[in-house]
């Protein structure tokens, strides 16, 4: 019996087609992805093949103005239109709290939404009961297939799930649910979830009875043969893991942003064992037509976005200096504003020992592309912020050793004075440079804000300590020459859309007046 699994993950509100790098589509003839194009390809495959499942491995939420405005209603609407068969909850599905998941998505989705390792307690337990499930048994042709969901156990540090959801260890939570499916005589089981490729592989290895793992979170690109675009494969598609009980378990992921549609063909024997598996992600490039009816619907929904862009988010009573003359040479108040917003967006009261799990921010000055003049009645709009942060990136959470941070700050000024983009703006960090010293030895003082303290204060950076830092995904990926970050990071979790982080902060503060306050000094 053959099953075709079509899968997406980490779409991050890319409902419209995008450029090849998943930013805003500029030249339509070169654009990719988007739900209208995805629908065309899905319909083609459904038409051609008998047993097809369309699955999403989480993180539909967060990433463009679509999510900012529609808050998840767009996800439910268009996933319903595409007739998804199931979705796993990702960490970003909790970005607007549990209410922001329940109302727009859980109550509106016409497909099951899954996670076996999220357990509700207290008053939430009854409110959310039945709105998401640990697993779902789906009829496919003459057979049944069990889908069991999972979500990153790090979600409380990455999003806002509140205090009434417990995120258990994935493997521990999955095994009893898979066992339950087995007792229901379901012998074909897919683990669909959002914990990253390393955890996906562990699930394939450790959870008895899982036949296929469809993952997300790490934006992993797998491909067999010559890859069709810029993404470099992390391995073959499917990636085969030998389980502890000796089975060959295919593990797949389909990069991110709706650029590819994962296509996996599985052949099962009559006892539900995987005989063979093959496939590849399908690049959704512009040679695949956008479905006119879905496209028309997108255009209808778009109207509200255009109106939103020009509405006031808040006011500034000071000039927001985002000029390259400032931000690439010295501390600039736009950099301070953005870093403060980044930390504010990551406030998660961890426990009595820590006032927060992260206190530090770094931001390449070259990523700040425009100032905002306060003389326009102080008004700040999304449109203004899009000029400051035009690249559609994310502000991510990483873990780095102190020694890596020191290297990053040395890199920040290694060729100081040439108006290059690597000069770092900061939050929760006090740095002093001595430019008379040779490159690679210019950082004379580097103090960082404590997290394990009731009254935050600045302490010298410790080389062997592991620190959490918020930074742009551009830096996490080694951009602007920060190869040491990419090479030495110990953990990387993708965060929220950059503009969204700053706009939320400004809306919350209502009136802002960031200053230049001595975060960066020259001796």
């Amino acid at each position: 019996w053959e099953l075709t699994i079509l899968h997406t993950n980490d779409v991050h509100s890319r409902l419209e087609q995008t450029s090849e790098d998943s930013s805003k589509c500029v030249n339509a003839s070169r654009c990719m992805g988007g739900v209208a194009r995805l629908f065309t390809k899905v319909q083609q495959i459904r038409r051609a093949e008998p047993n097809v499942l369309l699955l999403d491995a989480g993180d539909q939420y967060q990433g463009t103005i679509w999510f900012t405005v529609y808050k998840g209603a767009e996800v439910a609407h268009f996933m319903n239109a595409l007739r998804y068969d199931a979705m796993a909850l990702g960490n970003h599905e909790f970005d607007n709290g549990v209410e922001g998941l329940i109302e727009p998505l859980l109550k509106e989705a016409k497909f099951p939404i899954l996670s076996a390792n999220i357990k509700a307690k207290g008053p939430l337990a009854s409110q959310i009961s039945g709105l998401y499930l640990p697993y779902k048994v789906l009829p496919v042709g003459d057979e049944v297939v069990g889908i069991v969901g999972y979500t990153s156990k790090e979600t409380p540090f990455l999003s806002n799930p509140g205090t009434n959801l417990v995120f258990e260890d994935e493997i521990t939570a999955l095994q009893p649910e898979v066992d339950k499916l087995k007792t229901l005589n379901v012998n074909k089981i897919i683990a669909l979830g959002h914990s990253g490729f390393e955890t996906d592989k562990l699930i394939a290895q450790k959870v008895r009875g899982v036949d296929v793992v469809v993952g997300g979170h790490s934006n992993t690109f797998l491909y067999t043969g010559n890859p069709p675009s810029k993404e470099v494969p992390a391995g073959k598609y499917p990636f085969i893991v030998t389980s502890d009980d000796g089975r060959k378990v295919p593990v797949v992921q389909a990069y991110a942003f709706g650029k590819y549609l994962g296509y996996l063909k599985i052949e099962f024997d009559e006892r539900g064992n995987v005989i063979s598996s093959h496939g590849n992600p399908i690049l959704l490039n512009s040679s695949i037509p956008e479905d006119p009816s879905i496209k028309a619907d997108i255009n209808k929904w778009r109207i509200k976005l255009d109106n939103y862009s020009t509405q006031e988010l808040g006011k500034t009573i000071v000039y927001l200096d985002g000029s390259s003359q400032s931000c690439r040479f010295r501390e600039c108040n736009m950099g301070n504003l953005i870093c403060d917003a980044m930390i504010n967006n990551n406030l998660r009261h961890a426990d009595e020992m820590f006032w927060n799990h992260v206190s530090m921010c770094i931001l390449n000055g070259g990523g700040i592309r425009s100032p905002i003049d306060e003389r326009n009645n102080g008004t700040i709009t999304w449109e203004n912020l899009a000029a400051v942060l035009p690249f559609g990136g994310t502000f991510d959470l990483v873990q780095l050793k102190g020694s890596t941070l020191k290297k990053a700050f040395e890199h920040s000024v290694h060729r100081y004075g040439q108006s290059t983009g690597e000069f770092l703006q900061v939050g929760g960090i006090h740095v002093v440079y001595d430019l008379s010293r040779k490159p690679g030895d210019r950082v004379v003082k580097l103090d960082v804000l404590c997290t394990k303290c009731r009254v935050p204060s600045y302490d010298p950076l410790k080389m062997d300590e592991i620190y959490k830092v918020i930074l742009p995904n551009f830096l996490a990926n080694g951009g602007d020459g920060f190869q040491m970050i990419k090479d030495e990071l110990l953990r990387h979790d993708s965060g929220d859309q950059d503009i969204n982080v700053v706009s939320t902060y400004i809306s919350k503060m209502k009136v802002i007046y960031p200053a230049v306050e001595g975060r960066i000094k020259f001796s």
Partner: antibody, heavy 121, light 107 residues
Framework: QVQLQQSGAELARPGASVKLSCRAS????????LSWVKQRTGQGLEWIGE????????YYNEKFKGKATLTADKSSSTAYMELRSLTSEDSAVYFC??????????????WGQGTTLTVSS | DIVMTQSHKFMSTSVGDRVSITCKAS??????VAWYQQKPGQSPKLLIY???YRYNGVPDRFTGSGSGTDFTFTISSVQAEDLAVYYC?????????FGGGTKLEIK
């Protein structure tokens, strides 16, 4: 290399049936669709229907329902089209053509050489 | 059914000329349009798919453009071997339909 080899010319009586064949080679037969196209002498092209050999799913032009039946034999990588209740209107060249539904080339990328059917008493 | 209309049944041109053939769909077909060349006694050959993508090995003098309902096929510099009938076809909805064809004649 990809080839679609069609059966030879057919002469048939009105009211009879014929079965045309299209043997595929050079690619995985079950991973593509196969369409059949009719062309009367000096006329344009008309799509009859398509079959997906992997699933056996068939789709027909309403105009040819009851006239044409599409089948495929996976073991020999051969697609067939049976035409029944033949009339002189069925006299034409019939092409099979491949369709890559997993790729992005929206069109028929390989065609057979065509089979000429003549219906005459 | 979607009707594909090629307004010119015949077009006369000279070697080296630029020639454009138009095709109009009766409803929005996005970019799901292919163009074929058929020479006498031969099967059709795919030249352009998805409205503007040149198929493997097709000379770059052949181009396609358009989306929605209006499509154009262009030969930038006609060669003697381009004498043929050219068909547009929509691949958006079944039944897939072809235009009536445009016969390119060399003066």
């Amino acid at each position: 290399q990809v080839q679609l080899q069609q059966s030879g010319a057919e002469l048939a009586r009105p009211g009879a049936s014929v079965k045309l064949s299209c043997r595929a080679s050079g690619y995985t037969f079950t991973s593509y669709g196969l369409s059949w196209v009719k062309q009367r002498t000096g006329q344009g092209l008309e799509w009859i229907g398509e079959i997906y050999p992997g699933s056996g799913n068939t789709y027909y032009n309403e105009k040819f329902k009851g006239k044409a039946t599409l089948t495929a034999d996976k073991s020999s990588s051969t697609a067939y089209m049976e035409l029944r209740s033949l009339t002189s209107e069925d006299s034409a060249v019939y092409f099979c053509a491949r369709y890559d539904y997993l790729g992005s080339s929206y069109g028929f990328d390989y065609w057979g050489q065509g089979t000429t059917l003549t219906v005459s008493s | 059914d979607i009707v594909m209309t090629q307004s010119h049944k015949f077009m006369s041109t000279s070697v080296g000329d630029r020639v454009s053939i138009t095709c109009k769909a009766s409803q929005d077909v996005s970019t799901a349009v292919a163009w074929y060349q058929q020479k006498p006694g031969q099967s059709p050959k795919l030249l352009i798919y998805s409205a503007s993508y040149r198929y493997n090995g097709v000379p770059d003098r052949f181009t396609g453009s358009g989306s929605g309902t209006d499509f154009t096929f262009t030969i930038s510099s006609v060669q003697a071997e381009d004498l043929a009938v050219y068909y547009c076809q929509q691949h958006y909805n079944t039944p897939y339909t072809f235009g009536g064809g445009t016969k390119l004649e060399i003066k």
